[in-house]
Amino acid sequence: VPPGEDSKDVAAPHRQPLTSSERIDKQIRYILDGISALRKETCNKSNMCESSKEALAENNLNLPKMAEKDGCFQSGFNEETCLVKIITGLLEFEVYLEYLQNRFESSEEQARAVQMSTKVLIQFLQKKAKNLDAITTPDPTTNASLLTKLQAQNQWLQDMTTHLILRSFKEFLQSSLRALRQM
């Protein structure tokens, strides 16, 4: 159930509507719940979650990561720079979320929910950002060839890639929400 549509919300018509920040917070937590469910299936299906061979698969990936220069940590915190990084990072993750779509058996709907909820989150955040010009959108052609390359990997690498995407996306969202809670 997407945020704002659970029975508690229906049963409390007199509650104040969520602010934009509260809505973003709730949306990220909803996505984190989805990632947890997907990670459960991944970890149950293979031993990737305990593997020490992550570096082999990471060579093929360029997953977004928070760095000091992005302005999202306490030292050098910069609201606008950080917001641009969060939105840019989420846009870059979209191709990897597309890759995840055919990677799950029992959690297929959950994978779709994570993907769609991320699109909604990006829209929420774009409304919050003042400097939309600074946000670079990934090139569709580059994304298409990356997707083809990832899908052409052997089974072991595909499993490892799935694990790494979920782990990195979770960490990126956690760092993003930590920073957003300071704004």
Partner: nanobody
């Protein structure tokens, strides 16, 4: 939810040091964001510091920055608060808190598990 137990509080003179510990039961400690809050007599509970799961993202309240250091040991399921250059205004009950989403932040509502607290008294 996890169980949290604070220890290390006590009476110390101004300028002195104390190290608080927060021991957490449960195998999922390493996925939690952890925080320290404090409540002085007659005041509301306030944020002190918090730390993410792998210690690379730490925030401090302005009032303790440069004096207090938060850290964690995921192998031992323990979080610490090293308090140096203590002042009388640091006197409070110190609580540790855990956020199962691994996010944390400066508000009480972001945390879903709390310890009972440990008393810190700084005399002048």
């Amino acid at each position: 939810q996890v169980q949290l137990v604070e220890s290390g509080g006590g009476l110390v003179q101004a300028g002195g040091s104390l190290r608080l510990s927060c021991t957490v039961s449960g195998r999922t400690f390493s996925t939690y964001a952890m925080g320290w809050f404090r409540q002085a007599p007659g005041k509301e509970r306030e944020f002190v510091a918090d730390i993410n799961w792998n210690s690379d993202n730490i925030w401090y309240a302005d009032s303790v920055k440069g004096r207090f250091t938060i850290s964690r040991d995921n192998a031992k399921n323990v979080m610490y608060l090293q308090m140096n250059s203590l002042k009388p205004e640091d006197t409070a009950v110190y609580y540790c808190a855990a956020d199962s989403y691994g996010v944390g932040g400066g508000k009480e509502e972001y945390y879903d598990s709390w310890g009972q607290g440990t008393q810190v008294t700084v005399s002048s």
